[in-house]
Interface confidence: medium
């Protein structure tokens, strides 16, 4: 006997009727006396409803469940289940007998749509640039468990520093608790969305930070004009340093570095304490100079990575911040000049010169110029690749043409450090040796 | 109809800059965040960062951090991404791609036809 | 940064064929979507949200998958689907492409 019953699970509300399909092809001369219908729990076998001996049994679950004894007779051996709950989610079979039997599975798939989310501060008053704060996204009632997403004002995912629990009420329904930690910039958006998987509901909601500018002015914060040059692998300094007012102590300060760009926390100093490095263990105060307004910032083995713009943050009563931005660099290597050919040169023979130099940052400056000091410009074609770590080895090949005799010479300038490199090479146009 | 008109071709020298715009046109300008992409010949693509247009808020992608700088003028519905110490490398199909309407949307809806930037000595 | 490995980078196929490619994450994502793009044109949203069928996407393609593995199916190949298909993630920062899957006439 065949039954069918839908591939797709049901999906139904938490505390709506949800109707379970099931259906046969009743022969020629079928009547309610042949069939035994018996709906079960696919898993546990709990009887669930049952229609034997020409009668409806009735629902031995929870008395919520019910057939439909007006369509029984055209094949139709539906279960209606009443006011449904989270615990009534799984598998349920239909199995139908008349001469032959025949039975199939539903899945209930129980569902329940999530609230809009309430946003908390804390701290929720007195907020400057360079607080950490704790975002909290609470939704209530919802079911399954929800996905949980964070956004800033850019529509960036943030998805470290958040912490998200979701816990079950006595109804097996769900709330979320989600908490975003961000150190505050000037002002910013972030935004909180949870998603019902299998309602594909989403509700979200805002929160829009703007600290506060003391009324009695910002503290001044100051840090080189210049960017702060950096050889590769070396330390430097990060200078920054404000006023301390008399009376003045350390437990009223604190100091946040960042990242200008990404808003990462790179060092903090708060609570009258030195909280440590968040960039790599790279970082470090000088903490005997604070006392006097010295907020710099020692960055150590300096890589590629590094270059960019660092905010110093400084509260105390008031606040105030500065950027300075980081150049990285790293020195050429003298250029090596390879010949292809090497040998048997003659006038007129066309020759590639290659002039190479390794290991060095940013990107070069290169500069070719014949033995009486004319620029050679044409026929050169200039790469630069960056290797793991960021530094550029640079290939610059010269095509030229040989005269009787000719000096080529190859510059190769770091634009940063003002640094020239460069390598010669003679060519005679006699056999070479 | 939604469209994201960009600007022509350019063909530029090692170490300068250049500048490309997308005009939007079809929908509120300032309800959709605005991001730019890249695709070298015969390459993939790349993703660069991207505007906020209500607020000229930024975020680029840190591989171009100090090269590149995104802006817009609402006024003429208008957003712009200038590369600086342009290289070879850089050498390219640039569009301007606009982010799904809704804040959580991470997937771009609409694109402009692309601009070639030509980078040679 | 989460790289995507989309495999294969390559397929022949004909017309009518059923086409499945893939998009590989190196951790978890939330979800993935899908681009098509053909020879001097821009690309165009195809999947988005892992399953859903962007606006005007004929139903013979569909999108599937969780965590860091993702699949694109194209049920019955069309002339007009040969193409490089990209996917892409942003459920953590940077956004991220595939490298693209090539779909070319056998």
């Known amino acids: 006997l065949e039954v069918q019953v839908p591939e797709d699970p049901v999906v139904a509300l938490v505390g709506t009727d949800a109707t379970l399909c099931c259906s046969f092809s009743p022969e020629p001369g079928f009547s309610l006396a042949q069939l035994n219908l018996i709906w079960q729990l696919t898993d546990t076998k709990q009887l669930v409803h049952s229609f034997a001996e020409g009668q409806d049994q009735g629902s031995a679950y929870a008395n919520r469940t019910a057939l439909f004894p007006d369509l029984l007779a055209q094949g139709n051996a539906s279960l209606r289940l009443q006011r449904v709950r989270v615990a009534d989610e799984g598998s349920f079979t239909c199995f139908v007998s008349i001469r032959d039997f025949g039975s199939a599975a539903v899945s209930l798939q129980v569902a329940a749509p999530y609230s809009k989310p309430s946003m908390t501060l804390e701290p929720n008053k007195d907020l400057r640039p360079g607080d950490t704060v704790t975002i909290t996204c609470s939704s209530y009632q919802g079911y399954p468990e929800a996905e949980v997403f964070w956004q800033d004002g850019q529509g960036v995912p943030l998805t470290g520093n958040v912490t998200t629990s979701q816990m079950a009420n006595e109804q097996g329904l769900f709330d979320v608790h989600s908490i975003l930690r961000v150190v505050l910039g000037a002002n910013g958006t972030y935004s909180c969305l949870v998603r019902n998987p299998v309602l594909q509901q989403d509700a979200h909601s805002s929160v829009t930070i703007t600290p506060q500018r003391s009324p009695t002015g910002a503290v001044e914060v100051q840090v080189p004009e210049d960017p702060v040059v950096a050889l590769v692998g070396t330390d430097a300094t990060l200078r920054c340093s404000f006023s301390p007012e008399p009376g003045f102590s350390l437990a009223q300060l604190n100091l946040i570095w960042q990242l200008t760009d990404t808003k990462q926390l790179v060092h903090s100093f708060t609570e009258g304490r030195d909280q440590g490095s968040a960039y790599a263990n790279r970082t470090a105060l000088f903490p005997d100079l604070l006392a006097q307004g010295n907020a710099s910032l020692r960055l150590q083995r300096v890589r590629v990575a590094d270059e960019g713009s660092f905010t110093c943050f400084v509260s105390i009563r008031d606040f105030g911040s500065a950027a300075v931005s980081l150049q990285v660099a790293a020195p050429y290597s003298k250029p090596s000049m390879t010949l292809e050919p090497n040998k048997d040169l003659r006038p007129g023979d066309t020759v590639t010169i290659t002039c190479s130099s390794y290991r060095g940052y940013p990107e070069a400056e290169v500069f070719w110029q014949d033995g009486q000091g004319v620029p050679l410009t044409g026929n050169v074609t200039t790469s630069q690749m960056a290797n793991e770590q960021g530094l550029f080895d640079v290939h610059s090949v010269l095509r030229v043409v040989l005269g009787a005799n000719g000096t080529y010479s190859c510059l190769v300038r770091n634009p940063v450090l003002q640094q020239d490199a460069h390598g010669s090479v003679t060519i005679t146009g006699q056999p070479m040796t | 109809e939604v469209q994201l008109v960009q600007s022509g071709a350019e063909v530029k020298k090692p170490g300068a800059s250049v500048k490309v715009s997308c005009k939007a046109s079809?929908?509120?300008?300032?309800?959709?965040?605005m991001h730019w992409v890249r695709q070298a010949p015969g390459q993939g693509l790349e993703w660069m960062g991207g505007i906020n247009p209500a607020s000229g808020g930024t975020t680029y992608n840190q591989k171009f951090k100090g090269r590149v700088t995104m802006t817009r003028d609402t006024s003429i519905s208008t957003a712009y991404m200038e590369l600086s110490r342009l290289r070879s490398e850089d050498t390219a199909v640039y569009y301007c791609?606009?982010?799904?309407?809704?804040?959580?949307?991470?997937?771009?809806?609409?694109w402009g036809q692309g601009t070639t930037v030509t980078v040679s000595s | 940064d989460i790289q995507l490995t989309q495999s294969p980078s390559s397929l022949s196929a004909s017309v009518g064929d059923r086409v499945t490619m893939t998009c590989s994450a190196s951790s978890s994502v939330s979800y993935m979507h899908w681009y098509q793009q053909k020879p001097g044109k821009a690309p165009k949203l195809l999947i988005y949200?892992?399953?859903k069928l962007a606006s005007g996407v004929p139903s013979r393609f569909s999108g599937s998958g969780s965590g860091t593995d993702f699949t694109l199916t194209i049920s019955s190949l069309q002339p007009e689907d040969f193409a490089t298909y990209y996917c892409?993630?942003?459920?953590?920062?940077?956004?991220?492409f595939g490298g693209g899957t090539k779909v070319e006439i056998k």
């Open positions: 892409q993630q942003w459920s953590s920062a940077p956004l991220t």
């Open positions: 791609a606009r982010k799904g309407k809704d804040y959580f949307d991470w997937y771009f809806d609409v």
């Open positions: 079809g929908y509120t300008f300032t309800e959709y965040i």
């Open positions: 949200d892992t399953s």
